[in-house]
Amino acid sequence: DTEIKVNPPQDFEIVDPGYLGYLYLQWQPPLSLDHFKECTVEYELKYRNIGSETWKTIITKNLHYKDGFDLNKGIEAKIHTLLPWQCTNGSEVQSSWAETTYWISPQGIPETKVQDMDCVYYNWQYLLCSWKPGIGVLLDTNYNLFYWYEGLDHALQCVDYIKADGQNIGCRFPYLEASDYKDFYICVNGSSENKPIRSSYFTFQLQNIVKPLPPVYLTFTRESSCEIKLKWSIPLGPIPARCFDYEIEIREDDTTLVTATVENETYTLKTTNETRQLCFVVRSKVNIYCSDDGIWSEWSDKQCWEGEDLSKKTLLR
C-alpha cells in the first residue's frame, strides 16, 4: 500500500484590490488534484494581522477567501490541503503548509500620520471625520481621505474637506447608500514637499458611531396625585423608535437629581405634593438591538413645570 500524499495549494497569495484593508487571499489547487475528483478536497486557511495572538481559521472548498485587515500592520497567512478520510479510506490527509505575508511598505515616520482621528455618523445620516495633522509636519503637508465599503466599485476620495489654515483636517461625506452593518474602510494619506507622510488606516461600522439628535416635544402629564408621566418624541430622522435608549435627568426644586435610563419614550416619576418645580432633560443613544456601540446625543432643551396643579393641563414645550 502506497502512502497517500497531497501537495499544498500553489501560488498562495494575498491580493490587495485597493479597498483599503479588504483583502483577497487566493490560491491554486495542488498539482494532480484530479486524482481525487470523486472527493471534495478542502483547504484549511489561517490568517492574522502580525502581532495578533490568535489566528482566524477557515475551512473552505473555494480557492479564495476575503476579509478585512488592519493595513497599519502586516498580514500573515498559511494554508494547507485537506483530504477527508472518505478520500483516503482511512484518516484525514493533510499537506504541508504554504505560507505568505503582505504589508504596505510604510512611507514616512509614524509621527507624520494624522492624529486623533474621530468619525461620527450624525443621526445615522451624515458622516463626518476629523483629525489633527501629524506631529511636526509643515504647513505644506496636506492630507487626503479615501474610503470604501462593499457596494462601491472602487475607493473614493473625499470631495468635501474641512480645512484649517489651508490644511485638510476633516471630511464631510456625501450620502452613503447601503453603508451600515458592514465594514467601512478609511485611509488618510498625505503629501509634503518636505518629507514623506505615513498613511493611516481605519475600519469601523457606521451604525456603531451614530450620534442621534436629541429627543423633542418633552411633556408632563399628571397620572395621579403622586405620579407624573414624562413623555417625549423620538428625534426626527431615519432612526426607528426601537433603536433608541434614553437617559433622563430630572431636578425637583433645584435639589433632588434623578437620572434614569429607559428604553421607551416615557418615564413615570413619583412626586410629593410639596414639589413646586420639576425640570427634565433627555438624551438619546442607539441601543444594543441596533448597534454594538454608539454616542449619546446632546441633551434636549430643558422642560420645566412650575405651579400648583398639574392635573388641569398638560405642559408642552
Epitope: D11, E13, I14, V15, D16, P17, Y24, Q26, Q28, P29, L31, S32, D34, H35, L63, H64, T100
Partner: antibody
C-alpha cells in the same frame, strides 16, 4: 464573455526592447493567473512567462529569464510583457492566455506579432 | 526540462472516422497534461485538462486519456471542422512545455 486583446507588437532591431500589453475583460482578472505563450514562424508553441492572480509569483523559462518581465495591473485589467535584449529567435506571434485552475490555458487572445531583425 | 513529443506531424482521416493523436513525455508528468486545437489562422483553443477532462463547450467527440508519460487525444466521428493542428502541454513542472503539434488533414 472572456476576451483577451494583445497589442504592442512590431519590428525591432536585435538588442532592442518592446512592451506587449494584453487587455482582459469578461472575468475577475485578479483571480486568475495569466501567461504569455509565443508561436514561432515554424508554428511551435513556446511558453514565455506566467504570473499569478495577485502578481506575487512569476515564472519564466531559462531562454527569457533576465530579459523578459511579466507584470500586471489588476486595477486596469491589463497584463504586460516587457522584452529587452531581443534576439532574432524571439521573433514570433505572442499570445496572452488565461491560466485556469491548474496551469493549463483555457482562453487565448488573437496574438500580436513581434519581429526581431536588423 | 520535460520534452513532450508528438511523433506524428501529420495525420490524415476522413469525416466520420476515429483518430488518435499521441503525446509522450520525457518523464512522469502524472495527469498534468492539456490538449489544444488550433484551426488555420486562429489562436489555440483549450480542449482537455488533467489528461482526460473536457473544458465546457468542447464536444464529447474529443476524449483525452493517459497518465505518467503516455497521453492520447481521441477524436471520434471526425467532422470537417476538425481540420486543425493539435498540441499537448505538460504543467507538472516549470518550465511548461508543449508538443510539436500534430496536423489533422481531412481527406
Amino acid at each position: 464573455e472572456v476576451k483577451l486583446v494583445e497589442s504592442g507588437g512590431g519590428l525591432v532591431k536585435p538588442g532592442g526592447s518592446l512592451k506587449l500589453s494584453c487587455a482582459a475583460s469578461g472575468f475577475t482578472f485578479s483571480s486568475y493567473g495569466m501567461s504569455w505563450v509565443r508561436q514561432t514562424p515554424e508554428k511551435r508553441l513556446e511558453w514565455v512567462a506566467t504570473i499569478s492572480g495577485g502578481g506575487s509569483y512569476t515564472y519564466y523559462p531559462d531562454s527569457v529569464k533576465g530579459r523578459f518581465t511579466i507584470s500586471r495591473d489588476n486595477a486596469k485589467n491589463n497584463l504586460y510583457l516587457q522584452m529587452s535584449s531581443l534576439r532574432s529567435e524571439d521573433t514570433a506571434l505572442y499570445y496572452c492566455a488565461r491560466r485556469d485552475l491548474r496551469s493549463a490555458m483555457d482562453y487565448w487572445g488573437q496574438g500580436t506579432s513581434v519581429t526581431v531583425s536588423s | 526540462d520535460i520534452v513532450m513529443t508528438q511523433s506524428q506531424k501529420f495525420m490524415s482521416t476522413s469525416v466520420g472516422d476515429r483518430v488518435s493523436v499521441t503525446c509522450k513525455a520525457s518523464q512522469n508528468v502524472d495527469i498534468n497534461v492539456a490538449w489544444y486545437q488550433q484551426k488555420p489562422g486562429q489562436s489555440p483553443k483549450a480542449l482537455i485538462y488533467s489528461a482526460s477532462y473536457r473544458y465546457s463547450g468542447v464536444p464529447d467527440r474529443f476524449t483525452g486519456s493517459g497518465s505518467g508519460t503516455d497521453f492520447t487525444l481521441t477524436i471520434s466521428n471526425v467532422q470537417s471542422e476538425d481540420l486543425a493542428e493539435f498540441f499537448c502541454q505538460q504543467y507538472n513542472n516549470y518550465p511548461l512545455t508543449f508538443g510539436g503539434g500534430t496536423k489533422l488533414e481531412i481527406k
